[in-house]
């Protein structure tokens, strides 16, 4: 019996009924409800919200809703011993101190339990020394400093501006450079868009606003004390010295008012070029140390945060499938926030809530999806994707056998310009087809499809008439599902115009000013962009859970594999002499890609023609589609990153947020000209080509006729 026979809604109206039930006014109401107090991971307030969501999902009609708890390592400031940075004179007297907290936004003056800005998982320490300004603290910034400018960061405190790359990568780079402390700050060049007022009068960052965030380098490990396994009641925990990904030097974030006071005194080398200058009225001198008059003054950090094993709670809701209950489509987003979470995560959580309500309404009318849908409200995402990762570790055997797809649902908006989608190539056609059926919310596109406005505003750099879809990186809860388990994944949100707004993320990201009012006044007063994101995320889940044949097109994987192979080959060809010397060939990879393309093409033909009324053949074909993403997983993982196991995609080693293609080969080639043992280095390139070629070939064979 197909799921469509098990419903009192006619098949062609299933999706329409689901989408029509989604209401902007409900999303607005849910967002307000989720943002009135802070919901920091590990706190009583966030536990209460978990129980509220559990109760409401049950009311909405899900079959079951359970809390899944774990005891994981979290990090908090010391309530009685605040973190700050000072300038000290030659006598050791503090002549300037940074602020201890952000001034509260209007209407929130009397809210308690607002965690002050801090860098989660910073070790304690009170280092003092000369300051070095390191721009964004990217790999290339340290290359510029160390190799070109001959500036040594060893024993120095570095100050870096937020933006461009994940803050954890900045800290890792600073550690490798020998720094003894890191100060992170938000420069107006990156967090203050021209022509826009600062909060509460616009969406720009005020001078006292500060970005919180974790500074881990977990590489997909989850809880630092229980890598690979769930942090349950009988878990064996590593000692803190063996914990995964913890920084070894103190780190603290500040706003641009305080940064001004540190940077205005900087002496030493001038900035190497204009790309090192922000928008403050300071020289952006690199240092080390302060200029003439102030050369005896030093910077001192005072960091007293503590790491604590704390209980966290995921909410897991189940809507059982009518036909294939053992096939799971997962919609998940986090619930924990740094403060109010007006955008991150509650603009996403409110959308998930409305999607659950709509599915529940259909279920109450007698409908069920073909496949099981799991809904998740993850905890402790902000502390390193901990809730999602621990749950996936606990359920990995089920997920690797039954997981069809994972759709992520963090922030629904980071702007209000156009759609942004990152997903597996398997979902390209699903996203294209769905957005062609949805109305655009954009001004000037009334009566036009979302696909049309999206393509116009964010065109694909390769294919004319198509929209840009990006690679999945990390920094969000899809990581464990995609990068570790090989479950087809995707994410969608509304974004800014990257052409005109060069600032990083949105200005008030992870600050106390990320409030309900920020969204309601400045980003999406009618909640029409939220509704559109709900339609995209919900529509994807609906199709993945309800279509008879899984809406995956393996031919799109073939196209990108060729593109990625060309790209990595051209990177390698920057070293033609070494390729010749060490007999480096990409023939095996190109051959595997060619085989994949042919086999995928034949599989697609069979997919059009097979007898869909035969449940065994249908299940067989769907399993080949479901397991294709899984086939790109290397059980041994990437070098030094065992939990990043996808051979085609991994988070960049230089920026966790960005996706890198053929990451094993890419990392082997990176900065290869500086390696002390070129023979060994090129040997590793060859090994990585071999792994990639084998994996692509093996994946292709999963699409071959089974007998």
């Amino acid at each position: 019996k197909s799921s469509n026979e098990a419903t009192n809604i006619t098949p062609k109206h299933n999706m329409k009924a689901f989408l029509d039930e989604l209401k902007a006014e409900n999303i607005k109401k849910f967002l307000y409800n989720f943002t009135q107090i802070p919901h920091l991971a590990g706190t009583e307030q966030n536990f209460q919200l978990a129980k509220q969501i559990q109760s409401q999902w049950k009311e909405f009609g899900l079959d079951s809703v359970e809390l899944a708890h774990y005891d994981v390592l979290l990090s908090y400031p010391n309530k009685t011993h605040p973190n700050y940075i000072s300038i000290i004179n030659e006598d050791g007297n503090e002549i300037f101190n940074t602020s201890l907290f952000e001034p509260p936004p209007p209407g929130y003056e009397n809210v308690s339990d607002i965690v002050p800005p801090f860098s989660a998982f910073s070790p304690q320490g009170m280092p003092e020394g000369d300051l070095v300004y390191v721009n964004y603290a990217r790999t290339e910034d340290f290359f510029k400093l160390e190799r070109d400018m001959k500036i040594n960061c060893s024993g120095k405190i570095v100050i870096a501006r937020y933006g461009k790359v994940f803050r954890g990568n900045k800290v890792k780079n600073a550690q490798l450079a020998g720094a003894k402390g890191v100060i992170l700050y938000s420069d107006p060049a990156d967090y203050f868009a021209p022509g826009v007022k600062s909060y509460p009068d616009g969406w720009n960052l005020p001078g006292g606003g500060v970005q919180r965030g974790n500074i881990l380098n977990l590489n997909g490990a989850g809880d630092p004390l229980t890598p690979g396994y769930p942090a349950n009641e009988y878990a064996y925990r590593r000692g803190i010295a063996e914990a995964v990904g913890l920084p070894s030097i103190p780190v603290h974030p500040i706003g641009y008012y305080d940064a001004q006071k540190l940077l205005e005194k900087m002496g030493g080398s001038a900035p190497p070029d204009s790309s090192w200058r922000g928008s403050l009225k300071v020289p952006y001198n690199v240092g080390p140390g302060f200029t003439g008059n102030f050369s005896t003054q030093k910077v001192k950090m005072h960091i007293h945060s503590t790491n604590e094993v704390t209980r966290i709670y995921n909410v897991i809701g189940t809507l059982r499938g009518a036909v294939e209950p053992d096939r799971y489509v997962i919609l998940g987003g986090h619930r924990d926030s740094w403060v109010f979470g007006g955008i991150d995560p509650q603009s996403g959580a409110a959308v998930v809530h409305e999607i659950v309500r709509s599915f529940g309404t259909l279920k109450k009318e007698g409908w069920r999806p073909r496949r099981t849908i799991l809904f998740a409200s993850w905890d402790a995402e902000e502390f390193g994707l901990l809730g999602s990762t621990e749950w996936a570790e606990e359920n990995s055997r089920l997920l690797q056998e039954r997981g069809v797809a994972y759709i992520n649902a963090d922030s629904s908006i980071e702007g209000n310009y156009t759609l942004r989608v990152d997903c597996t190539p398997l979902m390209y056609s699903l996203v294209h087809n769905l957005t062609k059926e949805l109305k655009s919310p954009d001004e000037g596109f009334e009566g036009k499809s979302l696909y049309e406005s999206w393509t116009k505003k964010s065109p694909s750099p390769e294919f004319s008439g198509m929209p840009r879809i990006s690679k999945l990186g990390s920094g969000n809860d899809f990581e464990v599902f995609f990068q570790r388990l090989g479950i087809a994944s995707g994410r969608a949100r509304y974004t800014k115009n990257w052409e005109t707004n060069k600032f990083s993320g949105y200005p008030l990201y992870h600050s106390v000013y990320e409030t309900y009012e920020l969204v309601e006044k400045f980003y999406d007063p009618m909640f029409k962009y939220h509704l559109t994101v709900a339609q995209v995320r919900g529509g994807m889940v609906f199709e993945l859970a309800n279509s008879i044949v899984l809406p995956f097109d393996c031919r799109d994987y073939a196209v990108v594999l060729r593109k990625y192979a060309d790209k990595i080959y051209s990177i390698s060809m920057k070293h033609p002499q070494e390729m010749k010397t060490y007999s480096v060939s990409f023939d095996s990879l190109f051959s595997a890609v060619k085989n994949f393309t042919e086999i995928a093409s034949k599989f697609s033909e069979r997919l059009q023609d097979f007898d869909k009324s035969n449940p065994i053949v249908l299940r067989m074909m769907n399993d080949q589609l479901m397991f294709l993403e899984r086939a790109f997983i290397d059980p041994l993982g990437l070098p030094d990153r065992p939990f990043y196991r996808h051979v085609i995609y991994a988070p960049s080693s230089h920026n966790k947020y960005a996706g890198e293609s053929f990451p094993g080969i890419y990392d082997a080639l990176f900065d290869i000209e500086s390696k002390v043992d070129p023979s060994k280095a090129w040997g590793e390139v060859k090994r990585q080509i071999y792994v990639a070629a084998f994996t692509v070939q093996a994946a292709a064979e999963t699409l071959s006729e089974v007998a």
Epitope: F96, F101, E109, S198, D201, P206, G208
Partner: antibody, heavy 119, light 107 residues
Framework: EVQLVESGGGLVQPGGSLRLSCAAS????????MAWVRQAPGKGLEWVAN????????YYLDSLKSRFTISRDNAKNSLYLQMNSLRAEDTAVYYC????????????WGQGTTVTVSS | DIQMTQSPSSLSASVGDRVTITCRAS??????LNWYQQKPGKAPKLLIY???SLHSGVPSRFSGSGSGTDFTLTISSLQPEDFATYYC?????????FGGGTKVEIK
């Protein structure tokens, strides 16, 4: 040069009304928060109200909220304070002041206008 | 509301003296503390904002420090034109509140 000139003060009976004005020049008026601060004879300074760039948000001393209204006309580079149901304790010099944003200091002040509430 | 307490309420000093005025907030105001100077019959003038930043045109003999609840205004070498009343003001939260003032008189 930044200039703020208050007017509209004077003698008024208890229960009466008065409208103070502040004419601004020498800067782009719509780029700044504006505020009213008062000083009773021989006393210290007391913040009364402020208003954001376009007048969409106003903030008051709680005890004055029901009687005083701050407003602005950016086209005329003018700030206003409408004071109703005046009381003897409202007697003070009223200063108009400029601020950068919601949290910023008041960096330029007018010379003040005197309001006397007496029967 | 946040109470701002200045001390001393008045002081006598001579030209060339180093003068320190303190301001205490009833709760943590971070660094959102401003200092103003007022001469008799005149409007207040901003001296220092955000605890320690000098407003344009203000002589460098004026400096500010502190954070949280305790703040100081220092005049390193008192000049004749510095005899006036000084007010602190918190800008951290509404309502904005001022200290009671410190009158600096000629000894």
């Amino acid at each position: 040069e930044v200039q703020l000139v208050e007017s509209g003060g004077g003698l008024v009976q208890p229960g009466g009304s008065l409208r103070l004005s502040c004419a601004a020049s020498g800067f782009t008026f719509s780029d700044y928060y504006m505020a009213w601060v008062r000083q009773a004879p021989g006393k210290g300074l007391e913040w009364v109200a402020n208003i954001n760039y376009d007048g969409s948000s106003t903030y008051y001393l709680d005890s004055l909220k029901s009687r005083f209204t701050i407003s602005r006309d950016n086209a005329k580079n003018s700030l206003y304070l409408q004071m109703n149901s005046l009381r003897a304790e409202d007697t003070a010099v009223y200063y108009c002041a400029r601020g950068g944003d919601y949290w910023d200091a008041m960096d330029y002040w007018g010379q003040g206008t005197t309001v006397t509430v007496s029967s | 509301d946040i109470q701002m307490t200045q001390s001393p309420s008045s002081l006598s000093a001579s030209v060339g003296d180093r003068v320190t005025i303190t301001c205490r907030a009833s709760q943590d105001i971070s660094k959102y503390l401003n200092w103003y100077q007022q001469k008799p019959g005149k409007a207040p003038k901003l001296l220092i904002y955000y605890t320690s930043s000098l407003h344009s045109g203000v002589p460098s003999r004026f400096s500010g420090s502190g954070s949280g609840t305790d703040f100081t205004l220092t005049i390193s070498s008192l000049q004749p034109e510095d005899f006036a009343t000084y007010y602190c003001q918190q800008g951290n939260r509404l309502p904005r509140t001022f200290g009671g003032g410190t009158k600096v008189e000629i000894k």
